[in-house]
């Protein structure tokens, strides 16, 4: 095994305290060149320290990687449970290739892949295996009981062969940032609603605090005005109707907000922040921890 896991080409992809927002179809580089689409909010007081605040990380574990390509060495991280997150703009997919693997499948070692349309456990026949995510984000979690064991991964990204995103969908990465709902425009008028995806470091949870205004009276049918927030891991979904201050916490590091077509047509607005909380249990830490987490 390796004493010091490495990440190529950059040690830390997402700078602490920075949010990257990209609309569907926009490249990450394009959005950064223009500056942040959502200006960073004052950092809210956290209940617990965020996982991305350490200036030096000696392990690959716990990181969020936003580069187009990279190598992630999860061999010998010194912990049985190691997770990394990979994030790309909407409209791209993540490809993963296992360069080396010393997982002991019969001892319960495994690799877990997690995303909006991906819930995969794998161990056997990993070497040289190439996996392509269905969406732009992927959490890779390794469970390895043997010191020095683990996998060496190479990841890349490419344009999705087809996309299930709408023009008005947005993606947020990073440990905290500002949330602003989309407004009615040609891109949103026939979209059937717009979504905002939030992905943070893999051992973190997401807290959202926001004010919803001008929500309108429609609660049923095609013109219903509502906001849905869904935890990508547990699939727990919460609906918010009417003008209110909303607070929501995820169970995992991935969340999806949906603004209904009625919300957009009512010219409703949501403004607020999200930030990270320390996870009480690492998502997918143990396969048995998946028990009871399915269903909504």
């Amino acid at each position: 095994g390796q004493g010091t896991p490495s990440l190529v080409p950059h040690e830390e992809a997402a700078a602490p305290g920075r949010t990257t927002a990209t609309p569907a179809g926009a490249s990450l580089e394009w959005s950064q060149a223009r500056g942040l689409l959502f200006s960073p909010a004052p950092q809210p007081r956290r209940l617990l320290p965020g996982p991305q605040e350490n200036s030096v990380q000696s392990s690959a574990c716990g990181r969020q990687h936003l580069e187009p390509t990279g190598t992630i060495d999860m061999r010998g991280p010194g912990q049985a449970d190691c997770a990394v997150a990979i994030g790309r703009p909407l409209g791209e997919v993540v490809t993963l290739r296992v360069l080396e693997s010393s997982l002991n499948c019969s001892a319960g070692d495994m690799l877990l892949l997690w995303g909006r349309l991906t819930w995969r456990k794998m161990c056997r026949k990993l070497l040289d295996m190439t996996f392509s995510s269905k969406t732009n984000t992927l959490v890779v979690r390794q469970r390895c009981g043997r010191p020095g064991g683990g996998v060496l991964l190479r990841y890349g990204s490419q344009l999705a062969p087809e996309t299930f995103y709408r023009e008005c969908d947005m993606q947020l990465f990073g440990p905290w940032g500002e949330i602003v709902s989309p407004s009615l425009s040609p891109a949103t008028s026939n979209a059937g609603g717009c979504r905002l995806f939030i992905n943070v470091a893999p051992h973190a949870r997401i807290a959202i605090h926001a004010l919803a205004t001008n929500m309108g009276a429609g609660t049923e049918g095609a013109n219903a005005s509502y906001i849905l927030i869904r935890d990508t891991h547990s699939l727990r979904t919460t609906a918010f109707h009417g003008q209110q201050v909303l607070y929501w916490e995820s169970e995992s590091s991935q969340a999806e907000m949906e603004f209904s077509e009625g919300f957009l047509k009512a010219q409703a607005s949501l403004r607020g922040q999200y930030w990270t909380l320390q996870s009480w249990v690492p998502e997918m830490q143990d396969p048995q921890s998946w028990k009871g987490k399915e269903g909504t």
Partner: antibody, heavy 122, light 107 residues
Framework: QVQLVQSGGGLVQPGRSLRLSCAAS????????MHWVRQAPGKGLEWVSG????????GYADSVKGRFTISRDNAKNSLYLQMNSLRAEDTALYYC???????????????WGQGTLVTVSS | ELQMTQSPSSLSASVGDRVTITCRAS??????LNWYQQKPGKAPKLLIY???SLQSGVPSRFSGSGSGTDFTLTISSLQPEDFATYYC?????????FGQGTKLEIK
Amino acid sequence: QVQLVQSGGGLVQPGRSLRLSCAASGFIFDDYAMHWVRQAPGKGLEWVSGISWNSGSIGYADSVKGRFTISRDNAKNSLYLQMNSLRAEDTALYYCAKDPNSLYRSGSFDYWGQGTLVTVSS
Amino acid sequence: ELQMTQSPSSLSASVGDRVTITCRASQSISSYLNWYQQKPGKAPKLLIYAASSLQSGVPSRFSGSGSGTDFTLTISSLQPEDFATYYCQQSYSTPYTFGQGTKLEIK
């Protein structure tokens, strides 16, 4: 290639039991969730039950909850559906189906067995 | 339980026609919608997952679109082997539910 071969269907009286089996090959069985879906004669499709790769999570349709039990034996690459207290309305063609993911909550079915007919009648 | 409603329930068309089948969910299901094709005496076959993603091996004349509550399956140019029954299915929450089916017949 992926194959799902089903067995265990037949004619049974109301109130009795039946066990369906599904033998899988052509893929790493214990990497994937599995489901049972049924189709009453001349009718549409109805999801019956799903089970995660390690049996850690299981779900049932309300219509069969408490009467049917889904299980799997990863060592034998097999999926089972134990059906107790059968009713006339359980009469259907039962399909086993593979999920493209490991957790049954993925909820899609990329490969299907050939189906096995269960007829509940006195 | 989420209700899925397909329309039309049956449809007559000719080879070469462009055909659209719609599916409506009783509440928003984001893009968690799948389409299946079933021929008489056969098991269903997955065509489209996640509303618009083409399953491997499925001809490109099949396409899916939509999100939220309204979805469509389009066959750009009908082939003789496409005459079958088509089902939509939501994978947003359990219990997973299917539409009642659309039977596509030769005119």
